[in-house]
């Protein structure tokens, strides 16, 4: 074993950790459990204890990120560098970062939790054997009702353990149909659909009707994602395998490596590869989050790499199902922290152990009837990703820039962004900002340098808003957002971490919409945004002109001031006030003359 120079270590034994955000590859509960088990490996052999907390004051902050993610050590895309960790110390020291361009699993393929069946919700085991054939994804083979299922052990033929995979034929999520399954075919806008669709939506979410006619009944739900058969690469990344599919005239009901020299598994994403040529790679085994985390936490506790190939702290990933800690790892961590204290001796127990009840006999095959129980499901939308950058405390003093004509706010034609912060209006332009307080004879103060007050920010901002309860400031620029709490910044984070798709090029404004909720604007669209979860509800997407009739469609900034909404286009604003649930334009004016009270000379 090796330790960092000077035996860097924590000088207290009650270590805290914060899971700042999540990967979408695994259910949150699985991620939580993987980290808890990884810490437990180290606490089992030392006096250390690990307690999960929910603030960035934690000793070890755990973060998923991609590429440049807020430190000086960018990730490298899929494979290669899986994660990294910093040795013990304050701030970012001790933190562990995981590359979210990897496929995170428990080391044996994507984790697909099951429902119903006879496996008590256990995850699928990939690959599994059914009727002598190997399956690397859920299948409908052996069933007449089209429900995908999987074995939860390596061999269904011998073990008979199975469950149903997430499927729109079993249940839907959210929507307005109480989780009822899709009804195929269904009618939408006069057309017939026999599969989930994204038609009619701008956010890319797949949905279906839960009755035969959506146009008539307006009942729908969102289709569950199928991690086991969502392809990567090829020419259909993100789409689902279609089983069975035809390749060179032969039918395949599972992923195959036929036609490839490298042994990689692939599938078609339509029923006929020969005619459609649409395909992608099937998910691989992925990397065990538990094992990688256990290794990274070793670094975060003060262990360097080991030269013993069997050790957990050896610098190469190797999947194993045995006990991960090698004697070398134990020696290393005990060199830093000592052994776990022996528990107090306890008197022997005198109760006689009770015999365990015999196992209940399970059904012997995947059921061919639809489960009678009504499935209940919560949303599985993108997780509310936490911030991905270290805090950067910048100086709080505001420097006034030497004045030139362009530095007078009244000479600015179009501001980059405007926001009400505290009780003042802040106006941003090209790396500078002004403050304005309403009152007779008031003039904007400034300009001040954005870099002095918020040093992490770029010069050009698209929009800014303050969440009044938490006093958090959200700054948007292009496809990135920074969140300041006082002098601490989180970010930059990509907009997709807020649940905004790749088609959202920028956020052009925000309005308050109830306690802890905002409306985020981008061009002609808006979304409801939960400030605490830092996530938009993708199903809340709406057209601006439906909610705010009469405002221009090409506004470049939307902000709230004195409880009214302002939509800016060119040098002008359209002011909207809400009366009895109606949003009405009640004033159109110049930002400079009518808001900032600039003289009209």
């Amino acid at each position: 074993f090796q330790t960092f120079e000077g035996d860097l270590k924590w000088h207290h034994h009650n270590i805290t950790y914060w899971i700042q955000n999540y990967s979408e590859d695994l259910p949150r509960a699985v991620i939580d459990d993987a980290f808890a088990r990884a810490f437990a490996l180290w606490s089992a052999v030392t006096p250390l204890t690990f307690t999960r907390v929910y603030s960035r004051d934690a000793d070890i902050v755990i973060q998923f990120g991609v590429a440049e993610h807020g430190d000086g050590y960018p990730f490298d895309g899929k494979d290669g560098l899986l994660a990294h960790a910093f040795p013990p110390g304050p701030g970012i020291q001790g933190d562990a970062h995981f590359d979210d361009d990897e496929l995170w699993s428990l080391g044996k393929g994507v984790v697909v939790p099951t429902r119903f069946g006879n496996a008590d919700g256990a995850a699928c085991h990939f690959p599994f054997i059914f009727e002598g054939r190997s399956y690397s994804a859920c299948t409908t083979d052996g069933r007449s009702d089209g429900l995908p299922w999987c074995s939860t052990t390596a061999n269904y033929d011998t073990d008979d353990r199975f469950g149903f995979c997430p499927s729109e034929r079993l249940y839907t999520q959210d929507g307005n149909a109480d989780g009822k399954p899709c009804q195929f075919p269904f009618i939408f806008q006069g057309q017939s659909y026999s599969a989930c669709t994204t038609d009619g939506r701008s956010d890319g979410y797949r949905w279906c009707a839960t009755t035969a006619n959506y146009d008539r009944d307006k009942l729908f739900g969102f289709c569950p994602t199928r991690a086991d058969s969502t392809v990567m690469g090829g020419n259909s990344a993100g789409e689902l395998c279609v089983f069975p599919f035809t390749f060179l005239g032969k039918e395949y009901s599972t992923c195959t490596s036929e036609g490839r020299g490298d042994g990689r598994l692939w599938c078609a994403t339509t029923s006929n590869f020969d005619s459609d040529k649409k395909w992608g790679f099937c998910p691989d085994q992925g990397y065990s989050l538990f094992l990688v985390a256990a290794h990274e936490f070793g670094h975060a506790l003060g262990l360097d790499h080991s030269s013993v190939p069997e050790a957990l702290m050896y610098p190469m990933y190797r999947f194993t199902e045995g006990p991960p800690l090698h004697k070398d790892d134990v020696n290393g961590i005990r060199h830093l922290y000592g052994p776990r204290p022996e528990p107090e001796p306890r008197p022997p127990t005198t109760t006689t152990p009770q015999p365990t009840a015999p196992p209940t006999v399970c059904p012997t095959g995947p059921p061919t009837v639809h489960p009678s129980e009504r499935p209940t499901a919560g949303p599985t939308g993108p997780p509310s990703a936490g911030p991905t950058g270290p805090p950067t405390a910048g100086p709080s003093t505001a420097t006034t820039v030497p004045l030139s004509p362009v530095d007078d706010a009244c000479n600015v034609n179009i501001f980059d962004a405007i926001a009400e912060i505290g009780n003042q209006l802040y106006l941003f332009k090209d790396g500078k900002y002004w403050r304005f307080s309403e009152g007779r004879g008031s003039r904007p103060q400034g300009p001040f340098l954005i870099a002095d007050k918020w040093p992490a920010l770029p010069r050009k901002l698209d929009s800014v808003f303050e969440e009044r309860l938490s006093k958090k400031l959200f700054f948007f620029s292009g496809r990135q957002v920074w969140v300041y709490t006082g002098a601490s910044v989180l970010g930059p984070r990509r907009l997709d971490k807020l649940g905004l798709g790749a088609d959202v090029a920028q956020v052009t404004g925000a309005l308050r919409s109830g306690r802890g909720k905002m409306l985020l604007f981008s061009g002609r669209r808006l979304w409801r945004f939960d400030v605490k979860a830092q996530m938009v509800d993708p199903r809340s997407a709406s057209e601006v002109d439906r909610m705010f009739p009469g405002v221009p469609l090409d506004t470049h900034d939307v902000f709230q001031y004195r409880e009214k909404a302002y939509f800016c286009q060119d040098r002008f604003y359209w002011r909207v006030s809400s009366r009895s649930e109606l949003n009405q334009v009640d004033q159109v004016g110049y930002v400079t003359y009518d808001i900032l009270q600039c003289p009209e000379d």
Epitope: D71, G72, Y73, D79, L81, G91, P390
Partner: antibody, heavy 124, light 107 residues
Framework: EVQLLESGGGLVQPGGSLRLSCAAS???????SMWWVRQAPGKGLEWVS?????????FYADSVKGRFTISRDNSKNTLYLQMNSLRAEDTAVYYC?????????????????WGQGTLVTVSS | DIQMTQSPATLSLSPGERATLSCRAS??????LAWYQQKPGQAPRLLIY???YRATGIPARFSGSGSGTDFTLTISSLEPEDYAVYYC?????????FGQGTRLEIK
């Protein structure tokens, strides 16, 4: 003893190309990220590019993006920098440098070994 | 990008005196700061990594301190061979950046 030896510099016309090499010895080359850093005459240090230990990622300064390509051959313990579309402002001594940090162990910041540098002059 | 500002640009001191060189980051970089010494015609040489750790073979008269945005390189008693240009470099955020250098010259 750790050694880094650059070669391949010289005089080239604007728009021309050069390929720099850096031969490494005395450490396990394949375990470390390697960098190119340059220094214009009489000026300070500027990072140019970095390549991760296995070659899994490369990064470039904005000033050279799209024109320079970093690569490595771990079997030959050699680092390369292919420089195309050279400009007068690329004139500098180019150093290769070894990162102190390696792999997923990112505790340390610093380049602990540097080559002696090779001069690239872009002039017509 | 994070700006690194070194001061003073030039420092004139006599042998045996104490030298204090400053480096300021435009935003917090934790302790991800290195100091280098460069003599004319030579490559830079790593003196201090992670703000306060002396690199292999560096004499004890060199010490580094600071974290966040303000960092200091101290040479407790100047030797003739210490006269050179000193650079700081950050890796608290991507991309890495260098300071413009402080020239330490004989008074």
């Amino acid at each position: 003893e750790v050694q880094l030896l650059e070669s391949g510099g010289g005089l080239v016309q604007p728009g021309g190309s050069l390929r720099l090499s850096c031969a490494a010895s005395g450490f396990t080359f394949s375990q470390y990220s390697m960098w190119w850093v340059r220094q214009a005459p009489g000026k300070g240090l500027e990072w140019v590019s970095v390549i991760y230990s296995s070659g899994s990622a490369t990064f470039y300064a904005d000033s050279v993006k799209g024109r320079f390509t970093i690569s490595r051959d771990n079997s030959k313990n050699t680092l390369y920098l292919q420089m195309n579309s050279l400009r007068a402002e690329d004139t500098a001594v180019y150093y290769c440098a070894k990162d102190r940090a390696y792999g997923d162990y990112v505790g340390w910041n610093g380049f602990d070994y540097w080559g002696q540098g090779t001069l690239v002059t872009v002039s017509s | 990008d994070i700006q690194m500002t070194q001061s003073p640009a030039t420092l004139s001191l006599s042998p045996g005196e104490r030298a204090t060189l400053s480096c300021r980051a435009s935003q917090s970089i934790s302790s991800f700061l290195a100091w280098y010494q460069q003599k004319p015609g030579q490559a830079p040489r790593l003196l201090i990594y992670d703000a306060s750790y002396r690199a292999t073979g560096i004499p004890a008269r060199f010490s580094g301190s600071g974290s966040g945005t303000d960092f200091t390189l101290t040479i407790s008693s100047l030797e003739p061979e210490d006269y050179a240009v000193y650079y700081c470099q950050q890796r608290g955020n991507w991309p890495i950046t260098f300071g413009q250098g402080t020239r330490l010259e004989i008074k």
